[in-house]
């Protein structure tokens, strides 16, 4: 996740539990990871200056047959206001950078935490 600035509105406001549940799921994935996540699949790194939920979904939706991230994909799909399909590409991606799904999940989790920490823990 190459850009951690500017937190634009993610569209329709998800329920109050949304972010907590997403963080919990990402924590579960990172903690329970034994073999390479999604067989080491690579996804586009994303630019978080725009709608984070849709950007993350556009990247992760291209990973199929990976049960470990299916819940995350469903959550992001519920938070993103427009329909996202595999192969879709927008300016939200950093075109020349691909990273492993495991790193993508870890970076997304760190970014979500950072949203609330600034000024509080630094």
């Amino acid at each position: 996740l190459t850009c951690l600035g500017g937190f634009a509105s993610p569209g329709p406001v998800p329920p109050s539990t949304a972010l907590r549940e997403l963080i919990e799921e990402l924590v579960n994935i990172t903690q329970n990871q034994k073999a390479p996540l999604c067989n080491g699949s690579m996804v586009w790194s994303i630019n978080l200056t725009a709608g984070m939920y849709c950007a993350a979904l556009e990247s992760l939706i291209n990973v199929s047959g990976c049960s470990a991230i299916e819940k995350t994909q469903r959550m992001l799909s519920g938070f993103c206001p427009h329909k996202v399909s595999a192969g879709q590409f927008s300016s939200l991606h950093v075109r020349d950078t691909k990273i492993e799904v495991a790193q993508f999940v870890k970076d997304l989790l760190l970014h979500l935490k950072k949203l609330f920490r600034e000024g509080q823990f630094n």
């Epitope: 937190f7 509105s9 972010l19 963080i23 870890k106 979500l112 949203l115 920490r117 509080q120 823990f121």
Partner: antibody, heavy 111, light 112 residues
Framework: EVQLVESGGGLVKPGGSLKLSCAAS????????MSWVRQTPEKRLEWVAG????????YYPETMKGRFTISRDNARNTLYLQMSSLRSEDTAIYYC????WGQGTSVTVSS | DVVLTQTPLTLSVTIGQPASISCKSS???????????LNWLLQRPGQSPKRLIY???KLDSGVPDRFTGSGSGTDFTLKISRVEAEDLGVYYC?????????FGGGTKLEIK
């Protein structure tokens, strides 16, 4: 100097609602995440809610049971906490925090 | 949720003497970005909490250097090299590595 001034607390009946405000000054409010933390009569501290700098992202610990809503108005440099379906266990001093802490506003839920 | 256990509950210290407070976490507070998000707060009698230390050992501006934060993983310590009268109050540790953020139960520092 960072200043956070909370207001809106008071005595409310169980099941009632209250909206707390926090007026911020002395820093660029719109560039910082903000939180509400409460201190129970037993002096225990609990994180109530957090909100990102732009206001798009909010976090509530599961213990808050969806009865609270945090929001902010960056044009007015003000943080809010809307509290509904209040219970006696919500009785506490509520602090607005961003590294620095406000003086707090007292909320008492009692019939 | 992460549990922070502070010891002792109460600490009685003579002015000019050192003091030490422990904060133990039920999980490591080292995050995957290499940072450890642990704060120390002081709540003086009748006042709101004030942050003294962040990121384990960094002193907030205006905090005297007699305060020192240290530790890693699950074990953290706040030390006061020479206690002064203005140091009395309740000290809390606060972690921001794991969500939800949680606080220790507090340690009351009394002056003998």
């Amino acid at each position: 100097e960072v200043q956070l001034v909370e207001s809106g607390g008071g005595l409310v009946k169980p099941g009632g609602s209250l909206k707390l405000s926090c007026a911020a000054s002395g820093f660029t409010f719109s560039t910082y995440a903000m939180s509400w933390v409460r201190q129970t009569p037993e002096k225990r501290l609990e994180w109530v809610a957090g909100i990102s700098s732009g206001g798009s992202y909010t976090y509530y610990p599961e213990t808050m049971k969806g009865r609270f809503t945090i929001s902010r108005d960056n044009a007015r440099n003000t943080l809010y906490l809307q509290m509904s379906s209040l219970r006696s266990e919500d009785t506490a001093i509520y602090y607005c925090t961003r590294g620095s802490w406000g003086q707090g506003t007292s909320v008492t839920v009692s019939s | 949720d992460v549990v922070l256990t502070q010891t002792p509950l109460t600490l009685s210290v003579t002015i000019g003497q050192p003091a030490s407070i422990s904060c133990k976490s039920s999980q490591s507070l080292l995050d995957s970005d290499g940072e450890t998000y642990l704060n120390w707060l002081l709540q003086r009698p009748g006042q709101s909490p004030k942050r003294l230390i962040y990121l384990v050992s960094k002193l907030d501006s205006g905090v005297p250097d007699r305060f020192t934060g240290s530790g890693s993983g699950t074990d953290f310590t706040l030390k006061i090299s020479r206690v002064e009268a203005e140091d009395l109050g309740v000290y809390y540790c606060w972690q921001g590595t794991h969500f939800p953020w949680t606080f220790g139960g507090g340690t009351k520092l009394e002056i003998k």
